[in-house]
Amino acid sequence: ELQMIQPEKLLLVTVGKTATLHCTVTSLLPVGPVLWFRGVGPGRELIYNQKEGHFPRVTTVSDLTKRNNMDFSIRISSITPADVGTYYCVKFRKGSPENVEFKSGPGTEMALGAKPSAP
């Protein structure tokens, strides 16, 4: 029913710049939050959770022009080599006592592109 769309398989980024990771969701159902992670499995790193936590380098991006989906994209500022990896937007279904992972996007691999040229 719900689709998680991450259109870019690969995103080349530059150290010091801002990276935009796109994710659109076709339905709010099942009810529950969308979180961003880097990597998969139990060792994955939480990148953004709007409801709780402090993520000073992350801001949300909202494209309101699309009638048929919702935008859950994020921007990560001040990129460093430590930020490379594959990023996933993940839909959770509200549950008790804990939310349950429902569906993940296919992932976007963030890799370093060419270094900025000297002025």
């Epitope: 009810v31 529950g32 919702m70």
Partner: antibody, heavy 118, light 112 residues
Framework: EVQLVESGGGLVKPGGSLRLSCAAS????????MSWVRQTPGKGLEWVAT????????YYPDSVKGRFTLSRDNAKNSLYLQMNSLRAEDTAVYYC???????????WGQGTTVTVSS | DIVLTQSPASLAVSLGERATISCRAS??????????MHWYQQKPGQPPKLLIY???NLESGVPDRFSGSGSRTDFTLTINPLQAEDVATYYC??????????FGGGTKVEIK
């Protein structure tokens, strides 16, 4: 042209049951989240139930949970609301409404009136 | 539950003037920068009709004299200029990921 046509309303005694139906046409019913919203003069608009496009997930407010059951038949482009243990406070106009994204209510039917009274 | 408080409850505005309706939510209805607040128009004997979705987006076919603004907890519906056919009751509605979804109490707009 999008059409949502409700039926099944009527007069019922407290504790009784009713089954509301909503026939949909003019859009891809199986792609839409569907809901019922009711309206009373005293309480205004109140969300009553929602079902996901494939019918897997249903949601209800506490006021009807355990008494109302929402289902759908995508092959028949139809939505159903089974209402049991009806109370006087369930008296309202019941609207069937579509939600492409499970967010805003895009289209509404004309409504069917449910009266619960002894 | 997220409570939506609309004000005023009723509003009388001269034809051609601006009508402004406020909707305040008891907590934020924003998700990832999108405000899940919507506005509907209801005329007597008719079902509600979607005017504005996600705070500021004009639904297809709705005249551009209707506009919406706001974020987080404070939202506004503006009709400018008001036309005779705009006499109706207007409702705000939030559909954040916190159930239950709720509606405001409505604002009745009349001609002065």
């Amino acid at each position: 042209e999008v059409q949502l046509v409700e039926s099944g309303g009527g007069l019922v005694k407290p504790g009784g049951s009713l089954r509301l139906s909503c026939a949909a046409s003019g859009f891809t019913f199986s792609s839409y989240v569907m809901s019922w919203v009711r309206q009373t003069p005293g309480k205004g608009l109140e969300w009553v139930a929602t079902i996901s496009s494939g019918g897997t997930y249903t949601y209800y407010p506490d006021s009807v949970k355990g008494r109302f059951t929402l289902s759908r038949d995508n092959a028949k482009n139809s939505l159903y609301l089974q209402m049991n243990s009806l109370r006087a406070e369930d008296t309202a106009v019941y609207y069937c409404a579509s939600q492409l994204t499970g967010s805003e209510f895009d289209y509404w039917g004309q409504g069917t009136t449910v009266t619960v009274s002894s | 539950d997220i409570v939506l408080t609309q004000s005023p409850a009723s509003l009388a505005v001269s034809l051609g003037e601006r009508a402004t309706i406020s909707c305040r939510a008891s907590e934020s209805v924003d998700l990832y920068g999108t405000s899940f607040m919507h506005w509907y128009q209801q005329k007597p004997g008719q079902p509600p009709k979607l005017l504005i979705y996600r705070a500021s987006n004009l639904e297809s076919g709705v005249p551009d004299r209707f506009s919406g603004s706001g974020s987080r907890t404070d939202f506004t519906l503006t009709i400018n200029p008001l036309q005779a056919e705009d006499v109706a009751t207007y409702y705000c509605h939030q559909s954040s990921d916190e159930l239950p979804w709720t509606f405001g109490g409505g604002t009745k707009v009349e001609i002065k």
